[in-house]
Interface confidence: low
């Protein structure tokens, strides 16, 4: 998988998770999240050659499609696959909230 | 949705469904294929502003982030989001046989 | 994609109490962050901030006009109400709503605008 | 509550003029600071947001620079359809408007 265990101990090209903090006030203009002050989101990016992580038979075709006409520019993406939510405190007015917040971490990747 | 019905009658820079015809045997050198000799397999390119077509919180949380911090290289990608078979008829010898692949063409596309 | 609609009275009369619908399409408010303002606009002047509804149902309203404003919504239907009382001939504004992208503060995407003018 | 103040009021410029319109917050408001550009009978539309961040679509000769108390609206070199009322909006503490800025054809 294309995840922290592989991505984050090898240094590579094509598609893999990678490492990326977001501070909410900072990074978003978010400043109604109370704690935490960030999380680490990370994101998904690099190249997808030929049957790198491919999701479906339609990335597949097209990552064969691009080496075969490398000028084209129809080619798969380096895209999340797994996410985690992520658990948030704000305040409505004095009253603390907690909410978990879906689909906010990346956990690993795909070529699709 | 980001579909044929919307894209193709609409110039958009911003991710969409982009229409792309596959020849088998020419595109993919796939010579096991008697028929179809190639089809509409379309992808989906395009860029991913803030809050375009969405997949994710991640993706939006991404897309407001690389909004905010241009230089950065973190951002979604336009990527296929509904997919459907292809029927095809392809040779075991003498013997016809009838298959669909799943996944091989793209109806309309996210960003993610 | 994101599209908002107002809808309302025209015409009030002085006294009486205005409702508006905003009917929105493209997000929903159960998305967590989402939220809903309204802004007016009497004729030929600048835009005023009357109130706004979260997905949370956390509210807030202009202090001016606090008294006068209540803020709803109804998930289900993708729609936002906003009732004001005692309406004035200096309440004839467009009305607009937009939306608001988790607690932002500037409205991405606006409605047309309603046109309400207070008259006897 | 905050009082945003624009200026000017009103200007007259050509096309291809650089055009630069202020705001000023009456206390600290950080960058939460937006800028809208309305057209006569249309709902405004929004252009910079975090006082220097542009809105995807908006075209680059449109920047937002400030923080704190003051804000400034540049437009590098102005085109027909940018006449227009501009609009700087704090969202520090509620959310309020200025006056607007009429940018006319000289």
């Known amino acids: 998988a294309l995840d922290a265990a592989y991505c984050f101990r090898n240094v590579q090209d094509n598609c893999c998770l990678r490492p990326l903090y977001i501070d909410f006030k900072r990074d978003l203009g978010w400043k109604w999240i109370h704690e935490p002050k960030g999380y680490n989101a990370n994101f998904c990016a690099g190249a997808c050659p030929y049957l790198w992580s491919s999701d479906t038979q339609h990335s597949r075709v097209l990552s064969l499609y691009n080496t075969i006409n490398p000028e084209a520019s129809a080619s798969p993406c380096c895209v999340s696959q797994d996410l985690e939510p992520l658990t948030i405190l704000y305040y409505i007015g004095k009253t603390p909230k907690i909410e978990q917040l879906s689909n906010m971490i990346v956990k690993s990747c795909k070529c699709s | 949705a980001l579909d044929a019905a919307y894209c193709f009658r609409n110039v958009q820079d911003n991710c969409c469904l982009r229409p792309l015809y596959i020849d088998f045997k020419r595109d993919l050198g796939w010579k096991w294929i008697h028929e179809p000799k190639g089809y509409n397999a379309n992808f989906c390119a395009g860029a991913c502003p803030y809050l375009w077509s969405s997949d994710t919180q991640h993706s939006r949380v991404l897309s407001l982030y690389n909004t905010i911090n241009p230089e950065a290289s973190a951002s979604p990608c336009c990527v296929s989001q509904d997919l459907e078979p292809l029927t095809i008829l392809y040779y075991i010898g003498k013997t016809p046989k009838i298959e669909q692949l799943s996944n091989m063409i793209v109806k309309s596309c996210k960003c993610s | 994609q994101v599209t908002l609609r107002e809808s309302g009275p025209a015409l009030v009369k002085p006294t009486q109490t205005l409702t508006l619908t905003c009917t929105f399409s493209?997000?929903?408010?159960?998305?967590?962050?989402?939220?809903v303002g309204w802004i007016r606009q009497p004729p030929g002047k600048a835009l005023e901030w009357l109130a706004h509804i979260y997905w949370n149902d956390d509210k807030s309203y202009s202090t001016s006009l606090k008294t006068r404003l209540t803020i709803s919504k109804d998930t289900s239907k993708n729609q936002v109400v906003l009732t004001m009382t005692n309406m004035d001939p200096v309440d004839t504004a467009t009305y607009y709503c937009a939306r608001d992208f988790y607690y932002s503060g500037y409205f991405d995407s606006w409605g047309q605008g309603t046109l309400v003018t207070v008259s006897s | 509550d905050i009082q945003m103040t624009q200026s000017p009021s009103s200007l007259s410029a050509s096309v291809g003029d650089r055009v630069t319109i202020t705001c000023r917050a009456s206390?600290?408001?950080?960058?939460?600071l937006n800028w809208y550009q309305q057209k006569p009978g249309k709902a405004p539309k929004l252009l910079i947001f975090g006082a220097s961040s542009l809105q995807s679509g908006v075209p680059s000769r449109f920047s937002g620079s400030g923080s704190g108390t003051d804000f400034t609206l540049t437009i590098s070199s102005l085109q027909p359809e940018d006449f227009a009322t501009y609009y700087c909006q704090q969202t520090n503490t509620m959310n309020t408007f200025g006056q607007g800025t009429k940018v006319e054809i000289k």
């Open positions: 493209g997000f929903s408010l159960s998305t967590s962050g989402m939220g």
């Open positions: 206390q600290d408001i950080s960058n939460y």
